[in-house]
Amino acid sequence: DGCNDIFMKNEMLSASQPFAFNCTFPPITSGEVSVTWYKNSSKIPVSKIIQSRIHQDETWILFLPMEWGDSGVYQCVIKGRDSCHRIHVNLTVFEKQWCDTSVKGLPNLSDEYKQILHLGKDDSLTCHLHFPKSCILGPIKWYKDCNEITGERFTVLETRLLVSNVSAEDRGNYACQVILTHSGKQYEVLNGITVSITERAGYGGSVPKIIYPKNNSIEVQLGTTLIVDCNITDTKDNTNLRCWRVNNTLVDDYYNESKRIREGVETHASFREYNLYTVNITFLEVKMEDYGLPFMCHAGVSAAYIMLQLPAPDFR
């Protein structure tokens, strides 16, 4: 059929909860292409009707929710003007047993469900939630050994659980839970994460580099909306936290009431020797109190600030 078979991706999935997989393969999917999903070499494409339990949503295949019978090989066909590529995705559905204490870890989980915390350091766990824009995700709750996590050493920030001064007792089975809303219906997502510990530095003692900001000022009009990116390069297996702070407080906490200034979701691009991370800060409306205040971007031991200033008056 003239289609290039690219690779086979294996995914272990939990029954009875939503799952989505995005058919992206840069640079193929960055141009003008059409994406169509099929199941088990069927000639009939997956439905695009949003009421269907399994349907295609733009480049995604979405299961609301996943069921036992959904195990199998799915193909996404990427057609360009002069090209055709096919990605094979092998989905295996299993019954989740997060609260079964006889299960010492879940060995067949994919890597993002196995995470490592570094003893004595401030570190974090990530709740990996890959869903299309049509899915609205609620706040994340974190559990350890089936008990909701509380205590001042733990802070929930976006999709991460920040753990300060990691101890040996922090190892074990975790789960992050979120309510997903799609077309008015609600579904529970519960991701189990097996967390191990290490004393190893992990990133060879190198320090993350903040490319921007550079302890600089930005001229911005009062009342405007402003988005500033913090760009950071760091080693591939770093465990550094990246965040924005003001007055030594996470901006999301500092502006918890008004939510006028928020930290964005972290993204990253992978290069051969390092990762480039971007985490933005959004000022929905710049106020007088924001001027002259250092907004700090932190990455591990590195930090850099931006300071807002009023534009110089134009006397022309």
Epitope: P107, D111, I197, T198, E199, R200, Y203, K236, D237
Partner: antibody, heavy 120, light 106 residues
């Protein structure tokens, strides 16, 4: 159950390169830390280095100019290369990994060991 | 580099005797790991995170210590305990092993 199977020559000539393979079953080398350790005659253990889940490598500074640890995720194997060997490198070489009771540094799983003699 | 000094280098014990071997670190160590090595076999994880026994290790073994001083104790030695025991640290690189304590049974 995690198993580590070692392969490679037992005799290497001085100034040549020692190359060993560790084949892993029951776990993915894209999780955790994958170590090499050697035991010299007379029972002296030396930690040589590791390759991590992301491909990051750590080498013992005493070996840094001569050692290379690499991996092939498609084969679920990792490798040790030691260049310019001398008779001082005669030892039993082990690959090992942790993760026991969620502790990456507890080296619970070991290969069977490869006894390497450096001799002309 | 953290130097781990094990003492004694060789010790001899009679069946049923209580024995303690020591591992001293040249700088503070967060946790100590112990391995058992018998001739012709691969090392076995024996004690991890200073005081936790690995699977299959008899309850007569125990580990303790903090800072720069750690020890492995056998409450009542049995014949199968004859082996060399190594301590190891992952707190500071380069990661190091002690010189070992060889336990012989009289």
């Amino acid at each position: 159950e995690v198993q580590l199977q070692q392969s490679g020559p037992s005799l290497v000539k001085p100034s040549q390169t020692l190359s060993l393979t560790c084949s892993v079953t029951g776990a993915s080398i894209t999780s955790g830390y994958w170590n090499w350790i050697r035991n010299f005659p007379g029972n002296k253990l030396e930690y040589m280095g590791y390759i991590s889940y992301s491909g990051y490598t750590y080498y013992n500074p005493s070996l840094k100019s001569r050692i290379s640890i690499t991996r092939d995720t498609s084969k679920n194997q990792y490798y040790l290369q030691l260049i310019s060997v001398t008779t001082e490198d005669t030892a039993t070489y082990y690959c090992a990994t942790g993760g026991y009771d969620y502790v990456e540094d507890a080296l619970y799983y070991w290969g069977q060991g490869t006894s390497v003699t450096v001799s002309s | 580099e953290i130097l781990l000094t094990q003492s004694p280098a060789i010790m001899s014990a009679t069946l049923g005797e209580k024995v303690t071997m020591s591992c001293r670190a040249s700088s503070n160590v967060r946790y100590m790991y112990w391995y058992q090595l018998k001739s012709g076999a691969s090392p076995k994880l024996w004690i991890y995170l200073t005081s936790n026994l690995a699977s299959g290790v008899p309850a007569r073994f125990s580990g303790s210590g903090s800072g720069t001083s750690y020890s492995l104790t056998i409450s009542s030695v049995e014949a199968e305990d004859a082996a060399t025991y190594f301590c190891q640290q992952f707190t500071t690189s380069p990661y190091t092993f002690g010189g070992g304590t060889k336990l012989e049974i009289k």
